[in-house]
């Protein structure tokens, strides 16, 4: 029988790759394979066997599988062996090309090309081009000292030119175990080349001018040459040398200038590489001064507000300010100056602040002055109203408005009105010599009715000064009407019925009209006249009544206009129970002996108590009080049967008792035949 | 200065766990396979585990595999050794080393109970 | 596991003489790109190993050329012409032909 193997005599493996190795025979139907390596260690590898084939499997390769793998074939009683040298080599990825920085044409630019992972490296060759043309070239002949997986890089510094844009930088990795075609052993890495040109010849062209007056436009507009094209980044140069960043356009327009806009303006062009600037001297001059007071000429100001007038300079830089009223009068106001403003507050106003204000603006030899009339009201909160009571149907009432703190006084209406109608109208017309804060009422009497509830009762009050600028010249104040209506027609319900039997049950709900609706309570009379509360709700609801539940019950119905009451008497009637029939002294008497015999019913009132005496001729009816019968010297007749009944609309309950009578000779006793 | 230094190294009980650490410096640590190396009590060298300048591909001897892991950062130009279920007979000194050109001082590990 | 055996265990040398010391791999350490991956440490006392010769017979840098290494297959020698007293502690051999990598057993070297 023949042994062959594939690959037949030599395996290149990269290291981590999966790897076959299949040993066959032929002219063997059953042969027995085993696997070793020539130095007899472990096999690192799977081995499978199917009929006349053995495949060992080694995934991942790794340094313990470099051996000379011996696969042997038994047949019967004769043996083969072959040998497959498997051998390593790592080279996994594609070298990778790094720059010391971006190319700029002219500067000296250092390139590193690194193999990684690589084995064996003494058998490595790296080759850097630009173009076609070969930079360096490097074999790592001394490298390998141990068989181990390193990074290998190839550097070299060269000058970039302008020619040089758009060529390619080649690195190309060579591992030289080429003695098998089907192994990829040149690998090699492209980038193209980018060359950049600092930025140069940056220039600035500025319209109007560069002499310019306050309150004046410009334009500067900044070009560079370079590659990329330079960015353009304008700054102003401060005083102590440093740069304030202002824009980063080509185009820069200044609008409104003023005295500080004066200075020197650089523009910058900057790309990736570099920066190159250029610098403009503007010059800003000065321009004739305007007063602005604010708010305006006129001014409402509230008494006890603070009120705060600014004059403000346009066009000069330092002005000096100086504030008076029309008349010379004291300022009674604060005045704080700053820069080209000066504020005079008045805080709080009052009537001596009714004045025109002047500010004189003094700026170099120039002055001028602005006024500001400052007039007063005082009309600081929404009417009050109150009433002399609680809203009742049919009962009067006296309604007050009244206005607080008003100023001035002669310009003052106050209206009332009920929904759309009105009730009251005053106006207070009349002349006042004194500057002061009065309070100023409306009073009105009315009988309300149920109608009237829901309106609203307006109270509006106006100032009648339009001629000043504030708001609000109107506030008014509004009520709405609820109309108490007394508890009235007061009703109970009860469910089944005021007369019930023990045990049942009973609803007895409560009715009462008024508004706002009346609440209701529930309460029992007591035996000595108080009322004992029961419930807030509108139906009281007895469970499982008792005899004790008897009694008078009284519903009453409260609002704030007053109470209303109804009673009803509930009546729990009981079936008799508990009866006892005695005889006093004793049920055995002797004759001539007093017996009282009295039936008593524990439980009930209101039950009628029947006693009779049986006999075989008839019963007799005795005639008794409050259940007593009372026998005066008994005979011998009244022995026998006496019966009790006691008896309601509920039903009844018997007992019976037997007398004996004792006669007085011969000691003989008598007793009833039955 | 080329130079290696571990750290980490401590008394553990038997089936537990440690890290090592191996900080370089002084050359270019991204392009050298690393190894760690012991040296038992009784001065026997054992090498235990092999990276690749990537950090791709790692390599131990039968008597850690699957106990160790060999890792390694780059950026912060360190190696690692992480063990666990650890044995007595994993006592030893460890020393990190590029190749076997350069050796760390070493850091002791004990696993006793 | 290929394994290396160095002899002799100790090696008692007077300072100004020669010193040599074995070791043999139980298999060859040629391998398959013709390269032997054989290195001698020494460590001295109180240190970390250091390397002194790789692939057989090259110094390391700072290494005295009374050092040389030698042999081929499975037969390696380091051998020291004049030993001086900073030559004492251990010396190891190590092969990087077979995974994995192993060490020999160590020879004392003491100083007489």
């Known amino acids: 029988f023949k042994i062959e193997t594939t690959p037949e005599s030599r395996y290149l493996a990269q290291i981590g790759d999966s790897v076959s190795l299949t040993c066959s025979t032929t002219g063997c139907e059953s042969p027995f394979f085993s696997w070793r390596t020539q130095i007899d260690s472990p096999l690192n590898g799977k081995v499978t066997n199917e009929g006349t084939t053995s495949t060992l499997t080694m995934n991942p390769v790794s340094f313990g599988n470099e051996h000379s793998y011996l696969c042997t074939a038994t047949c019967e009683s004769r043996k083969l062996e072959k040998g497959i040298q498997v051998e390593i080599y790592s080279f996994p990825k594609d070298p990778e090309i790094h720059l010391s920085g971006p190319l700029e044409a002219g500067k000296p630019i250092t390139v590193k090309c690194s193999v990684a992972d690589v084995y064996p490296f003494d058998r490595l060759e790296i080759d850097l081009l630009k173009g076609d043309h070969l930079m360096k070239s490097q074999e790592f002949l001394e490298d390998a000292d141990r068989k181990s997986l390193e990074t290998k890089s190839l550097e070299v510094t060269f000058t970039p030119v302008i020619e040089d844009i758009g060529k390619v930088l080649v690195c190309r990795a060579k591992l030289h175990i080429d003695e098998m075609d089907s192994v990829p052993t040149v690998r090699q890495a492209v980038k193209e080349l980018q060359v950049y040109i600092s930025p140069k010849n940056t220039v600035i062209s500025v319209n109007p001018s560069t002499k310019l007056q306050e309150g004046g436009s410009v334009t500067m507009t900044c070009s560079s040459e370079g590659l990329p094209a330079p960015e353009i980044f304008w700054s102003k140069k401060l005083d102590n040398g440093n740069l304030q960043h202002l824009s980063g356009n080509a185009t820069l327009t200044l609008i409104a200038m003023r005295m500080e806009d004066s200075g020197i303006y650089v523009c910058e062009g900057v790309n990736l590489i570099g920066k190159n600037r250029k610098e403009v001297e503007l010059i800003v001059q000065e321009k004739p001064f305007t007063v602005e007071i604010s708010p305006g000429p006129r001014i409402a100001a509230q008494i006890g507000d603070s009120v705060m007038l600014t004059c403000s300079v346009m066009g000069c830089e330092s002005p000096s300010f100086s504030w008076r009223t029309q008349i010379d009068s004291p300022l009674s106001g604060k005045v704080r100056s700053e820069g080209t403003n000066s504020t005079l507050t008045l805080s709080p106003v009052s009537f001596e602040n009714e004045h025109s204000y002047l500010c004189t603006v003094t700026c170099g030899h120039k002055k001028l002055e602005k006024g500001i009339q400052v007039e007063l009201y005082s009309f600081p909160r929404d009417p009050e109203i109150e009433m002399s009571g609680g809203l009742v149907n049919g009962s009067s009432v006296t309604v007050s408005c009244k206005v607080p703190s008003v100023y001035p006084l002669d310009r003052l209406e106050i209206e009332l009105l009920k929904g759309e109608t009105i009730l009251e109208n005053i106006e207070f017309l009349e002349d006042t010599d004194m500057k002061s804060l009065e309070n100023k009422s409306l009073e009105m009497t009315f009988i309300p009715t149920i109608e009237d509830t829901g309106k609203a009762l307006v109270c509006q009050a106006k100032l009648h000064i339009d001629d000043m600028e504030f708001e609000p010249k109107q506030r008014q104040s509004t009520q709405t009407l609820y109309v108490n209506v007394a508890p009235r027609d007061t009703t109970v319900l009860v469910s089944p019925s005021s007369i019930l039997e023990e045990g049942s049950s009973v609803n007895m709900t409560c009715l009462s009209q008024g508004f706002p609706a009346p609440k209701i309570l529930w309460s029992r009379q007591l035996p000595n006249g108080e009322l004992q509360p029961l419930s807030e709700n509108a139906t009281l609801t007895l469970i499982s009544t008792k005899m004790e539940d008897s009694g008078v019950y009284l519903c009453e119905g409260i609002n704030q206009a007053g109470r209303s009451r109804k009673e009803v008497e509930l009546i729990i009637q009981v079936t008799p129970k508990d009866i006892k029939l005695t005889a006093f002294p004793s049920e055995s008497v002797k004759e001539g002996d007093t017996v009282i015999i009295s039936c008593t019913c524990g439980n009930v009132p209101e039950t009628w108590i029947i006693l009779k005496k049986k006999a075989e001729t008839g019963d007799t009816v005795l005639k008794s009080i409050d259940g007593a019968y009372t026998i005066r010297k008994a005979q011998l007749k009244d022995a026998g049967v006496y019966e009790c009944e006691s008896k309601n609309k509920v039903g009844s309950q018997l007992r019976s008792l037997t007398l004996d009578v004792q006669g007085r000779e011969n000691n003989k006793d008598y007793f009833s035949p039955e | 200065e080329v130079q290696l230094v571990e750290s980490g190294g401590a008394l553990v009980k038997p089936g537990g766990s440690l890290k090592l650490s191996c900080v370089a410096s002084g050359f270019t640590f991204s392009s050298y396979a690393m190894s760690w190396v012991r040296q038992s009590p009784e001065k026997k060298l054992e090498w235990v585990a092999e990276i690749s300048s990537t950090g791709s591909y790692t390599h131990y001897p039968d008597t850690v595999t699957g106990r160790f892991t060999i890792s390694r950062d780059n950026a912060k130009n360190t190696l690692y050794l992480e063990m666990s279920s650890l044995r007595s007979e994993d006592t030893a000194m460890y020393y990190c080393a590029r190749g076997e050109a350069l050796w760390g001082q070493g850091t002791s590990v004990t696993v006793s109970s | 596991d290929v394994v290396m055996t160095q002899t002799p265990l100790t090696l008692s040398v007077t300072v100004g003489q020669p010193a040599s010391i074995s070791c043999k791999s139980s298999?060859?350490?040629?391998?398959?790109?013709?390269?032997?991956?054989l290195n001698w440490f020494l460590q001295r006392p109180g240190q970390s190993p250091k390397r002194l010769i790789y692939?057989?017979?090259k110094l390391d840098s700072g290494v005295p050329d009374r050092f040389t290494g030698s042999g081929s297959g499975t037969d390696f020698t380091l051998k020291i012409s004049r030993v001086e007293a900073e030559d004492l502690g251990l010396y190891y051999c190590?092969?990087?032909?077979?995974?994995?990598?192993?060490f020999g057993g160590g020879t004392k070297l003491e100083i007489k």
């Open positions: 190590w092969q990087g032909t077979h995974f994995p990598w192993t």
């Open positions: 298999h060859s350490l040629l391998d398959s790109y013709g390269k032997t991956y």
């Open positions: 692939l057989v017979s």
